[in-house]
Amino acid sequence: ASGSASGSASTLVHNGTSARATTTPASKSTPFSIPSHHSDTPTTLASHSTKTDASSTHHSSVPPLTSSNHSTSPQLSTGVSFFFLSFHISNLQFNSSLEDPSTDYYQELQRDISEMFLQIYKQGGFLGLSNIKFRPG
Amino acid sequence: SVVVQLTLAFREGTINVHDVETQFNQYKTEAASRYNLTISDVSVSDVPFPFSAQSHHHHHH
């Protein structure tokens, strides 16, 4: 967690409609998809895995939007607009779980927010979201 | 409450700050119902490019 007592996730969740998805044999096609040209760089990818049934698990990887190294500039530098968005969730209480990306509470909230934005902006030129951070209100 | 901060990426020229905020506000009710998230105090701003996750980490509005 950062000095501002927040949890952070720096991955781009892609809009599945804007990129061709590659899947592993165990996976199904999901909106949390990754363009095929990223598939050879598994070490830089964050994995989103959701248990669905005893016989199958959803897996998909999402590429990082940015690197934490200042000198590396994203490949998306041309033809892309970025917007910083913040909002309060008034019916949730901040607790230490939201400082730790490995907790169920963190992952559930991140998943819900990611899915929500993928749906709200699925019309038009939405490419994805990244750098989700949680902090006390 | 919990404050959520994130970055949205769009193809250039397809949307502006005002429309990002308007569209999000339009679905706050659905968000409350579908995801049990009661959303308020929405703020949207342009992000100057280039930027990185680290440099943006303490950007609070």
Epitope: T30, P31, R111, D112, Q119 | -
Partner: antibody, heavy 122, light 106 residues
Framework: QIQLQQSGPELVKPGASVKISCKAS????????INWVKQRPGQGLEYIGW????????KFNEKFKGKATLTVDTSSRTAFMQLSSLTFEDSAVYFC???????????????WGQGTSVTVSS | QILLTQSPAIMSASPGERVTITCSAS?????IHWFQQKPGTSPKLWIY???NLASGVPPRFSGSGSGTSFSLTVSRMEAEDAATYYC?????????FGGGTKLEIK
């Protein structure tokens, strides 16, 4: 045409578990949410929760957390609900119903399965 | 969670009669849906977003309301309209249903 076909009736003992299925056809399974609704004999409708087949994400009515588990198998276009530690109060007809993501959420649950009767009896 | 109260619980109407069923919410909601259910069958979406008729619903049905007060009206009752009608809100999680109104034909 669009259909949700549910599995057949179940007679189970108290304390056991049961898994019922809902097979979708006639639309893109991963595009729509699947909701589950409970109806006890002669009673009204009670919302259990939803699952989004596109991601496997789900959310429950607090009352059914720990009682119901929602899963999907996208290869067979089937949603499942498992009910555990069954009691007599779990005897009911359980329906699956599809609905829409944003921005079409306000269309409501437009197609329903025929229902699966679960009877808990010793 | 939001409580939906339907009234009346049971009512009878003669063919051709005008019928109104009400649904009252414990807190303000954006819109409601109405479902029709006949014995031994699954519910059918009947009216969505307060006032829009679902596919195949006869035009003698209508829906209206806002805030905490909503209604379903049948302009001229017919035998096939005999069923139980449920209202549902989805403005607040979890979605909730009204207790139902059983509409009978005289």
């Amino acid at each position: 045409q669009i259909q949700l076909q549910q599995s057949g009736p179940e007679l189970v003992k108290p304390g056991a578990s049961v898994k019922i299925s809902c097979k979708a056809s006639g639309y893109t399974f991963t595009d729509n949410y699947i909701n589950w609704v409970k109806q006890r004999p002669g009673q009204g409708l009670e919302y259990i929760g939803w699952i989004y087949p596109g991601s496997g994400n789900n959310k429950f009515n607090e009352k059914f957390k720990g009682k119901a588990t929602l899963t999907v198998d996208t290869s067979s276009r089937t949603a499942f609900m498992q009910l555990s530690s069954l009691t007599f109060e779990d005897s009911a007809v359980y329906f699956c119903a599809r609905d829409y993501p944003f921005p079409s959420y306000h269309y409501g649950m437009d197609y329903w399965g025929q229902g699966t009767s679960v009877t808990v009896s010793s | 969670q939001i409580l939906l109260t339907q009234s009346p619980a049971i009512m009878s109407a003669s063919p051709g009669e005008r019928v109104t069923i009400t649904c009252s919410a414990s807190s303000s909601v954006s819109y409601i849906h109405w479902f029709q259910q006949k014995p031994g069958t699954s519910p059918k979406l009947w009216i969505y977003s307060t006032s829009n008729l679902a596919s195949g619903v006869p035009p003698r049905f209508s829906g209206s309301g806002s805030g905490t007060s909503f209604s379903l009206t049948v302009s001229r009752m017919e035998a096939e309209d005999a069923a139980t009608y449920y209202c549902q809100q989805r403005s607040s999680y979890p979605p909730t249903f009204g207790g139902g109104t059983k509409l009978e034909i005289k």
